[in-house]
Interface confidence: medium
């Protein structure tokens, strides 16, 4: 099939990085500056993506591949191929139309992006709250109250960092 196609279509001989110039008897010409063709046999080159404003260049455009963008500090990518940049918020916040807002009580966000999500309801799994939630962190669920033997503590104290009476080396 390829051989037949080549005989019928001179453009199939044009490699990636070039285009088949119909203005010149289908001579292959290199892509103009700021354009690319990622496959052979193309009749036009595609315009390179330009990473401007809040976008910054992660990978430069070449004659055979498009530029790739990411976002400037304080922003993060959204959408396929980083089609949008969205403002970062602090942990414990979410982005609203009015800007970054603290998570409401009972919700948290441990990232700089995304929305505040409700704390886990430990009781739905028959467990108890081992560590309370904050705006930045979900609650930590522990064993169910019935699993705890009388007098047992639900929190194990940490081991001492060093033996008492010894100075650090």
């Amino acid at each position: 099939f390829e051989r037949t196609r080549s005989l019928q279509d001179p453009c199939s001989n044009c490699p990636a990085g070039t285009f088949c110039d119909n203005n010149r008897n289908q001579i292959c010409s290199p892509c103009p500056p700021n354009s690319f063709s990622s496959a052979g046999g193309q009749r036009t080159c595609d315009i390179c993506r330009q990473c401007k404003g809040v976008f910054r260049t992660r990978k430069e455009c070449s004659s055979t591949s498009n530029a790739e963008c990411d976002c400037t500090p304080g922003f993060h990518c959204l959408g396929a191929g980083c089609s949008m940049c969205e403002q970062d918020c602090k942990q414990g916040q979410e982005l609203t139309k009015k800007g970054c807002k603290d998570c409401c009580f009972g919700t948290f966000n441990d990232q700089k992006r995304g929305i505040c999500r409700p704390w886990t309801n430990c009781s739905l799994d028959g467990k108890s709250v081992l560590v309370n939630g904050t705006k930045e962190r979900d609650v930590v669920c522990g064993p169910s109250p019935a699993d705890l033997s009388p007098g047992a503590s639900s929190v194990t104290p940490p081991a001492p960092a060093r033996e008492p009476g010894h100075s650090p080396q």
Partner: antibody
Amino acid sequence: QVQLQESGPGLVKPSETLSLNCTVSGGSISNYYWSWIRQPAGKGLEWIGRIYTSGNTNYNPSLKSRVTMSVDTSKNQFSLKLTSVTAADTAVYYCARDGNWNYADAFDIWGQGTMVTVSS
Amino acid sequence: DIQMTQSPSSVSASVGDRVTITCRASQGISSWLAWFQQIPGKAPKLLIYTASGLQSGVPSRFSGSGSGTDFTLTISSLQPEDFATYYCQQTNSFPFTFGPGTKVDIK
């Protein structure tokens, strides 16, 4: 700035193969077509053919059966082989950069040329 | 193949003269024409691309015009370093072909 330098034997025996290299310095060989042109003494210029950095070639039909071009991007070099040479192939051989789109296949940078004589 | 012809084949001129060289293609080549200057013993040098585009670093006394089959290279005021042979070349279709050249020498 980009410079081209042809290299190869100045004397080739009839019926043998002429082999020339062109080294590109001061810039990348990538994303251009590269041509070979020859000029017999006191005569005009003849385009031999061109090669793209991917290895894609176009040859002058008058020489096609005898010409092979290749490219070595790692060495920033491209080469010409012309088989079954005769005295009519005696000429100055030039390599040239071809196909920077801005110049629409005009040869904007040339080597200084190398004289090849076909004689026994 | 597209045949390129040039006229005159040679011209004698003096410094300061206006010199015009014509190039004709055997079939239409749109604007896919370049002009080169060659000094004896040197490689050709690109002067004009796509019929009228002045190559970077080339003095503005050189200009090109034309499209289709008829093209012109003009040197508005000939300088001593301009005495050379001038070639036109088409890149409209394979094989790329050159004109036979026009020699500009001192009158």
